[in-house]
Amino acid sequence: LQEKIEEIAAKYKHLVVKKCCYDGVRINHDETCEQRAARISVGPRCVKAFTECCVVASQLRANNSHKDLQLGR
């Protein structure tokens, strides 16, 4: 997960945009990535970075938990 996120974040050369990506990686079981992104007011660049990293992190976590379930059988 960390390697993949670092790969994405490396594209963003504006520090705030990069940090928006990292914010998207934080675990939040109560809201979707879209719901969280809707509260961002600093600009579309932040929304885009946040959403991209949030979605990728969610997918990777889902894949990993699926593998864990398979291994547990």
């Epitope: 050369k13 504006h14 520090l15 705030v16 945009v17 940090k19 007011s41 600093v42 600009g43 579309p44 660049r45 932040c46």
Partner: antibody, heavy 118, light 111 residues
Framework: QVQLVQSGAEVKKPGSSVKVSCKAS????????IHWMRQAPGQGLEWMGY????????NYNENFKGRVTITADKSTSTAYMELSSLRSEDTAVYYC???????????WGQGTTVTVSS | DIVLTQSPASLAVSPGQRATITCKAS??????????MNWYQQKPGQPPKLLIY???NLDSGVPARFSGSGSGTDFTLTINPVEAEDTANYYC?????????FGGGTKVEIK
């Protein structure tokens, strides 16, 4: 309407520090990044750094080698720029500006003249 | 860091004529088709004023005689026709990445 109002002119001794304020009004202070630039007499614009008040995130121009510190007080919608170890080359007009959409500076403060002289 | 080189350093133009200022970036300021290049006008004793953002978008209240174009590393600010009140310094600026950088400026004088 959006306004950025800076503190008044300062005269400082070499080796001392200066702290310039930038009070924002007419918009939600935490929604936009505040940048600081400076302009030496007859010269161009030099970017110093910024703060994103909502998160407290900062980034600085490495040319200032740790001499600059940017802070923000959300309760008063004011950003501050402190420059230490002043030398004569720091004599300049210092500007704060709001960055819109992480793309461009749409509003600027009126400027604060800092003179460093022994 | 992205270095922005403006030319010419100064320019004298007659009223009604065209003024063209160029800004060359040391690397592309394009990201996914969006060019993070802006232009500012600064008159003596005043702070800079936004003229054009994202290469070609005029800020509100800016006269239509100002226009911007370009992509990647090469950008142009055009004033056509020039008026007496356009006497000022003009700066390009990139916001793609930190550190944010400005061009060295172009001084436009009216003959």
């Amino acid at each position: 309407q959006v306004q950025l109002v800076q503190s008044g002119a300062e005269v400082k001794k070499p080796g001392s520090s200066v702290k310039v304020s930038c009070k924002a009004s007419g918009y939600t202070f935490t929604d936009h990044i505040i940048h600081w630039m400076r302009q030496a007499p007859g010269q161009g614009l030099e970017w110093m750094g910024y703060i994103y008040p909502r998160e407290g995130w900062t980034n600085y121009n490495e040319n200032f080698k740790g001499r600059v510190t940017i802070t923000a007080d959300k309760s008063t919608s004011t950003a501050y720029m402190e420059l230490s170890s002043l030398r004569s080359e720091d004599t300049a007009v210092y500007y704060c500006a709001r960055e819109r959409n992480l793309e461009y500076f749409d509003y600027w403060g009126q400027g604060t003249t800092v003179t460093v002289s022994s | 860091d992205i270095v922005l080189t403006q030319s010419p350093a100064s320019l004298a133009v007659s009223p009604g004529q065209r003024a063209t200022i160029t800004c060359k970036a040391s690397q592309s300021v394009d990201y996914e088709g969006f060019n993070y290049m802006n232009w500012y006008q600064q008159k003596p004793g005043q702070p800079p004023k936004l003229l054009i953002y994202a290469t070609s978008n005029l800020d509100s209240g800016v006269p239509a005689r100002f226009s911007g174009s370009g992509s990647g590393t090469d950008f142009t600010l055009t004033i056509n026709p020039v008026e007496a009140e356009d006497t000022a310094n003009y700066y390009c600026q990139q916001s793609l990445e930190d550190p944010h950088t400005f061009g060295g400026g172009t001084k436009v004088e009216i003959k």
